[in-house]
Interface confidence: low
């Protein structure tokens, strides 16, 4: 049986604090009471808390905890959100510049190939952008499509300018011949290797950053259990029931409670560490052919070299293709 | 000879900031991000301690609250909290993570695996697998890396000079970047702060 309160004891201080938390005084006893109905702030003596107050404290404690968690992760969340945005924007700029450089190369070296070349280049770089953002496109197909589309234009405009405007028939034959005869040498394969490697790495880098945001958002909005709410209430608010307004929890006690409340969250630690170290490893390797900036901004030059390669072998190619696509050409002249 | 197209696209506004002391490149920005992220490598294991240090905890006071009573800060009772006969802290830990945390752990495991498979093995940045047919003279050599940027005077000296400060200021309309402020219903009338 707890001892009765001293005759002059009141719950005035507790009431004035609780009023800030919950306007309306009806839940706070006038003077200390036995508190036999309390479930969390179990009294050793008379108490200034009621069951309703206890419930309110639990709710507030859990909200406090959620807010503390959010403020803890705010800087980290920003760091990743901001960088994900910056890199995505930067990659888009790189793609745009790479397209501009490639178009400029065509305009100034092979004006007869424009505007068709512009169209094919535009489609290629659109696919590049979509791939980086996660679209299900095959990089080899993208590169093949670029060269398949370019070759008929190169053949009819550069190698064989006497031909009338190319018709669908010869185009299809020329597209096939492009691969069979390895018209561009090893350049398409070279570009495939460079582009696919650099874009894969870029894509996974962006995916990783976006997952980082998801991880923080998940832990940022965790709802804490009732058990945790009770532990937090006992730590932060039960002292008020005894009129101990200025007392603070013991440090070691706080750590024990927090480890209990955050046991699940702390399990992420191992995988979070691994995530940062794996991301570092990826970033350390993002150079030369694994650096999309390097690869894409140099692409105009490789494409230029590939066209020069075709021109160098034009005589041999024209003869072979003349035979190979003769049927299509005859139908065209009719 | 190949046309050197750089001057076609230089924004005159960019020229004004051409002489930046520290020229920020994509790769330097990436490395900087990793360095900052590494300062958060212990983020999750440090959370309990962080939250205690950011909530009211007795630091200089002689007395502190152990959940049941007022005790001396360095006494045995301060470490032994008043949780006996309440509910078992061990039980709380044994429940395991919430489903949402388990899901995010699975996603992290998956991305970590992807990141590891994508990482370039040390000393193997160049692939020498272009063995289908020898290049003719004037083509690139075995090292596909030699071909980056092409050859001759057509080779553009791309040196990772994408300037963020110049580019993002002028190439992107900053005001058009979508905000992250989706409307969430504010907590109804709760004061979720501490009072001493």
């Amino acid at each position: 049986q707890p001892p009765p309160p001293p005759p002059d004891a009141t719950c005035h201080q507790v009431r004035s604090f609780f009023q800030r938390l919950q306007p309306g005084l009806k839940w706070v006893p006038e003077t200390p009471v036995p508190g036999s109905d309390l479930q969390v702030c179990l009294p050793k003596g008379p108490t200034c808390c009621s069951r309703k107050m206890e419930e309110k404290y639990q709710l507030t404690a859990r909200l406090n905890m959620e807010q503390l968690l959010q403020s803890a992760s705010m800087e980290l969340k920003f760091l990743i959100i901001q960088n994900a945005a910056v890199f995505q924007e930067a990659f888009e700029i790189v793609v745009r510049h790479a397209k501009n450089y490639t178009n400029a190369m065509f305009k100034n070296n092979y004006p007869s190939l424009t505007p068709q070349a512009f169209e094919f280049v535009g489609e290629f770089f659109t696919d590049v952008s979509l791939y980086i953002l996660g679209s299900d496109i095959n990089v080899d197909d993208m590169v093949n499509e670029l060269f398949d589309s370019l070759f008929p234009v190169i053949y009819t405009q550069l190698m064989n300018p006497g031909l009338p405007d190319s018709a669908l028939d010869i185009n299809e034959c020329l597209r096939g011949a492009r691969r069979d005869l390895k018209v561009f040498g090893n350049f398409p394969k070279l570009i495939m290797t460079q582009v696919s490697k650099s874009l894969q790495v870029t894509r996974i880098f962006l995916q990783a950053l976006n997952l980082g945001i998801e991880v923080i958002n998940t832990t940022d909005h965790l709802k804490f259990s009732k058990d945790c709410g009770r532990m937090l209430t006992r730590m932060w608010y039960c002292s008020y029931c005894q009129g101990l307004m200025m007392v603070k929890p013991c440090g070691g006690y706080c750590n024990v409670v927090m480890q209990g409340c955050m046991a699940g969250v702390v399990e992420i630690d191992k995988y979070w560490r691994e995530y940062i170290l794996s991301l570092e490893e990826l970033v350390n390797g993002m150079y030369r052919i694994y650096d999309m900036e390097n690869v894409l901004l140099g692409l105009f030059s490789t494409i230029h070299d590939s066209i020069q390669y075709v021109q160098k072998n034009a005589g041999k190619l024209t003869t072979t293709i003349g035979k190979l696509c003769a049927h299509s050409q005859q139908r065209q002249y009719r | 000879s190949a046309y050197y197209p750089e001057d076609l696209f230089i924004d005159k506004k960019v020229l004004k900031v051409a002489h930046v002391e520290h020229e920020e490149t994509l790769s330097s920005r990436r490395r900087e991000l990793i360095q900052k992220l590494k300062s958060f490598i212990s983020f999750y294991s440090a959370l309990p301690g962080y939250i205690c240090s950011h909530s009211p905890v007795a630091e200089n006071d002689t007395l502190c609250w152990n959940g049941q009573e007022l005790v001396e800060r360095y006494s045995q009772k301060a470490a032994r909290n008043g949780m006996k006969n309440q509910f078992n802290l061990h039980e709380l830990k044994m429940k395991g993570p919430e489903p949402v945390v388990s899901q995010i752990i699975d996603k992290l495991k998956h991305i970590n695996q992807l990141l590891r498979t994508m990482s370039v093995p040390k000393g193997r940045v160049l692939d020498k697998n272009l063995d289908e047919e020898g290049f003719e003279s004037g083509d690139c050599g075995d090292d596909e890396d030699e071909c980056i940027g092409g050859s001759g005077d057509g080779m553009m000296k791309v040196k990772n000079q994408l300037r963020f400060l110049a580019e993002l200021a002028y190439d992107l309309d900053v005001d058009d970047v979508p905000g992250n402020n989706q409307q969430a219903t504010p907590k109804d009338n709760e004061i979720s702060t501490f009072h001493n």
Partner: nanobody
């Protein structure tokens, strides 16, 4: 010398609005993620909102949907538009960079704290 000057606070009724400003001198804040913090009497200083260099902003749940943070790089100033104010928003509001926070430290150097601007919400 770096200086941050907050202004625009005042007394407002619940449900009212205020716009507080933070003007910086001695530093170009366009390269910083900037944040607004507040401190009510006897309480910890807490972060309220922050805005990245690209103009993206985030908020703590308690103010989400009511507060909007923005920046004007030309004026080297950040703003916090506060609508539907509640008594619990009463505090001194400060701005600072959000770039130098480190986990485990209660306060951080950042750009140095200004004097803050008092916001009181009361009927």
């Amino acid at each position: 010398q770096v200086q941050l000057v907050e202004s625009g606070g005042g007394l407002v009724r619940p449900g009212g609005s205020l716009r507080v400003s933070c003007a910086a001198s001695g530093v170009d804040i366009s390269t910083y993620t900037m944040a607004w913090y507040r401190q009510a009497p006897g309480e910890q200083r807490e972060s309220v909102a922050a805005i990245s260099t690209t103009g993206r902003s985030i908020y703590i749940d308690a103010v989400q949907g009511r507060f909007t943070m923005s920046r004007d790089n030309a004026k080297n100033t950040v703003y916090l538009q506060m609508n539907n104010l509640k008594p619990e928003d009463t505090a001194v509001y400060y701005c600072n960079s959000a770039d130098d926070l480190k986990i485990g430290t209660q306060y951080f150097k950042g750009l140095g704290w200004g004097q803050g601007t008092q916001v009181t919400v009361s009927s």
